[in-house]
């Protein structure tokens, strides 16, 4: 049987360069801080490979004690760097990653920095801010999304084969027009997920199917034409 | 790079047949449909038919259906339509087309007058 | 047969324009498509692939979305070189069908 499998595929894409971040302009920082919510929990998820800037409460950095981040990840010890603005020090217990930075130095910006987000940055991360009148708290639950590398092939006749390898979180994979279809999840040890989807057409007027994945990174269609039915040699539509 | 070279123009008689050929270079041209397309002067774009080089099998449109015939060569790479008893109605310029549409010949014209 | 209404027919134009043009799919079937310009004595040529993707080489003025039976051509601030006749082509079922085609005429 010839080769029609054209395999198509998308090149990860390079996002090096950017970066996001939730971090409130200056201007917008609360000088009446005591209004601000003692506690606010955020899910942020954020493109693998991108820089990350996570940010404290916003709160004026003179009525400062202690700043506190503390960082939780996937089977990892409690990681937790501290400034201390009495004596200007800062402290580090149980972090390893070197990519988890402060954005400068602490007693000019309380910010912290993820350079080239991972897998293994997924997790939990709370900053907490000790003033006169009291602590404040941010939390941020971090969830690294993985763009799915996606295929189209054929691998019998009128069947054909879409997968989306290693997204993060599962892609939804459909297709026009709809044929009678399996879907199989594969998880990774690294919390990807691979989605294949092997469909079947009978009806014999389809002539290419396209394969539409969709994920939190962005959508990708590939499209295919069908082979011929065995045997089939003349038909008029 | 995808290449579908076109046969050259033709004037015909009414009555008489045609055999217009596509000669492929780029890809592996058993393994693509070869589609053809109709555009009369002044007119829209319309579907002939399409052939699987690998194994021969062809879909025509009913209104192409008894009157062309598409055939390949895989020997040569070359896809060839004929269109038999001719009339002026017939007169267009005809495409090929492969990979899923997105490679077009230059077309060839057929004139058909008495 | 699936058939594709193209609109409009035609289109006066200016240079600077934001032009859009639709294709939809009859029986509420969903379609893919590829859309197509065509001067005048040339082969149609390739812009826009499966509803959406600039082909390579395409200014970027030129743009597809839409999806299942409702498709739209736009091009966003129109060249003198853009003065041509387009199309789109379902190729999802056989008979694989185009629009009518949009012509386009400076005003």
């Known amino acids: 049987q010839p080769n029609n499998s054209l395999m198509l595929q998308t090149s990860k894409e390079n996002h090096a360069l950017a970066s996001s971040s939730l971090c409130m302009d200056e201007k917008q920082i609360t000088q009446n801080y005591s209004k601000v919510l003692a506690e606010v929990n955020t899910s942020w998820p954020v493109k693998m490979a991108t820089n990350a800037v996570l940010c404290c409460p916003p709160i004026a950095l003179r009525n400062l004690i202690i700043i506190t981040w503390e960082i939780i990840l996937r089977g990892q010890p409690s990681c937790t760097k501290a400034y201390k603005k009495e004596t200007n020090e800062t402290k580090e217990t149980n972090c390893t990653d070197e990519r988890i930075t402060w954005v400068s130095r602490p007693d000019q910006n309380s910010d912290l920095q993820i350079r080239t987000v991972a897998i293994t940055h997924d997790g939990y991360y709370r900053c907490i801010m000790v003033t006169p009148d009291g602590n404040f708290h941010r939390g941020y639950h971090l969830q690294v999304l993985v763009t799915p590398e996606v295929t189209l092939f054929q691998n019998r006749n009128r069947t054909a084969v879409c997968k989306a390898v290693a997204g993060k979180p599962a892609a939804h994979i459909s297709w026009i027009p709809e044929g009678d279809c399996a879907t199989k999840q594969e998880y990774w040890s690294n919390g990807t997920v691979t989605v294949k989807s092997t469909c079947h057409w009978e009806v014999h007027n389809v002539s290419t199917v396209t394969c539409h994945v969709s994920h939190l990174t962005g959508n990708k269609s590939l499209y295919i034409e069908l082979l011929p039915v065995p045997g089939a040699k003349k038909s008029a539509k | 790079q995808v290449q579908l070279v076109q046969s050259g123009a033709e004037v015909k008689k009414p009555g008489a047949s045609v055999k217009l050929s596509c000669k492929a270079s780029?890809?592996?041209?058993?393994?693509?449909?070869m589609h053809w397309v109709k555009q009369a002067p002044g007119q829209g774009l319309e579907w002939i038919g399409n052939i699987y080089p690998g194994s021969g099998s062809i879909n025509y449109d009913e209104k192409f259906q008894g009157r062309a015939t598409l055939t390949v060569d895989t020997s040569t790479r070359t896809a060839y339509m004929e269109l038999s008893s001719l009339r002026s109605e017939d007169t267009a310029v005809y495409y090929c087309?492969?990979?899923?549409?997105?490679?077009w010949g230059r077309g060839t014209l057929v004139t058909v007058s008495s | 047969d699936i058939q594709m209404t193209q609109s409009p027919s035609s289109l006066s134009v200016s240079v600077g324009d934001r032009v859009t043009i639709t294709c939809q799919a009859s029986?509420?079937?969903?379609?893919?498509l590829h859309w197509f310009q065509q001067k005048p004595g040339k082969a149609p040529k390739l812009l826009i692939s499966?509803?959406?993707n600039l082909e390579d080489g395409v200014p970027s003025r030129f743009s597809g979305s839409g999806s299942g039976t409702d498709f739209t051509f736009t091009i966003s601030s129109l060249q003198p070189e853009d003065i041509a006749t387009y199309y789109c082509l379902q190729f999802t079922y056989i008979p694989w069908t185009f629009g009518q085609g949009t012509k386009l005429e400076i005003k």
């Open positions: 087309l492969t990979m899923t549409g997105t490679s």
């Open positions: 780029g890809h592996t041209f058993t393994s693509y449909w």
């Open positions: 029986q509420g079937t969903p379609i893919n």
């Open positions: 499966g509803a959406s």
